[in-house]
Interface confidence: medium
Amino acid sequence: GSERTCCPVNWVEHERSCYWFSRSGKAWADADNYCRLEDAHLVVVTSWEEQKFVQHHIGPVNTWMGLHDQNGPWKWVDGTDYETGFKNWRPEQPDDWYGHGLGGGEDCAHFTDDGRWNDDVCQRPYRWVCETELDKASQEPPLL
């Protein structure tokens, strides 16, 4: 079968998922695409415990997650239900602020320096986190 038991090289295992933490920045759509090119997705936060885990690894740095409202309602990239799921917005957020002068509002969610969430302009080049479920993750190091 195609099930896997270990995370890929340089990914971090936590609670049956594998995580990869970028050290460079991309716009949200590019970060989303990059995770997909790892056969993964931008991180989907489903619990306070997962929030703390991610926060510990990213530190006080703006970092994209797999949550956006570019088509209207807020949606997680893996289909996890937003309305009933875990949320950790900063006070007054999300506010779809238009005052930034970059055109449009704010449609993509990121972890802020204190870990809580904010919506921001999707074109900003923030770091990002990829996640893939452990039974889908690669079990062997790359061969050369």
């Epitope: 195609s2 896997r4 090289v9 990869w20 990059y34 056969d39 050369l144």
Partner: antibody
């Protein structure tokens, strides 16, 4: 030993389709993406697309979107590339290549098939 | 899409020469670049990945450098078997574009 073995040369008429195979061995097929690259006579390398056999997720260069179809058969560790509505400009050598990974998201094509020559002529 | 400008398009050098091929990228791709060598009638062969890492079995006379938008492949002392065409390729999102190629001939 990692190997990618492609199907043989094809001669096709304009407007028809071709399906090229790439049989993988020597590694876990579902752990790596398979990419397709073509090279027209005397020209450079052109990326067509990628398939992840584990999930069947695919990515295509815009130029080939809708005309190329990438599939994978996990039971036989074989990837396929089908190209439809063939025209003379599609005459090229078509390669499959395994996408390796190191240091997180730094990728590279570490193993290549031997190539399949496609000639499109009326 | 990311644009790749590889130079020179061709060059002729003598055995023992130091050869440098450059690849300039239209945007910052950090270290997400690979170099390949292709000989006539053969599939490309991976030389360098992640901009600076030599692939297994590649002679140490080959080296890669650069990051961001400017990258270089260097052959410190050219050997007769180094003829062929060299390509750079980025991996900073799709499409995984290749450079136009540099044809290296031995004088």
């Amino acid at each position: 030993e990692v190997q990618l073995v492609q199907s043989g040369a094809e001669v096709k008429k304009p407007g028809s389709s071709v399906k090229v195979s790439c049989k993988a061995s020597g590694y876990t097929f579902t752990n790596y993406g398979i990419n397709w690259v073509r090279q027209a006579p005397g020209q450079g390398l052109e990326w067509i697309g990628e398939i992840f056999p584990r999930s069947d997720n695919t990515f295509y260069a815009q130029k080939f979107q809708g005309r190329a179809t990438l599939t994978a058969d996990k039971s036989t560790s074989t990837a396929y590339m089908e190209l439809s509505s063939l025209r003379s400009e599609d005459t090229a050598v078509y390669y499959c290549a395994r996408k390796g990974r190191d240091y997180g998201t730094s990728h590279y094509f570490d193993y290549w098939g031997q190539g399949t020559t496609l000639t499109v002529s009326s | 899409d990311i644009q790749m400008t590889q130079s020179p398009s061709s060059l002729s050098a003598s055995v023992g020469d130091r050869v440098t091929i450059t690849c300039r990228i239209s945007e910052n791709i950090y270290s997400n670049l690979a170099w390949y060598q292709q000989k006539p009638g053969k599939a490309p062969k991976l030389l360098v990945y992640a901009a600076i890492n030599l692939a297994d079995g590649v002679p140490s006379r080959f080296s890669g450098s650069g990051s961001g938008t400017d990258f270089t492949l260097t052959i410190s002392s050219l050997q007769p078997e180094d003829f062929g065409t060299y390509y750079c390729q980025h991996f900073w999102g799709t499409p995984f574009t290749f450079g136009q190629g540099t044809k290296l001939e031995i004088k």
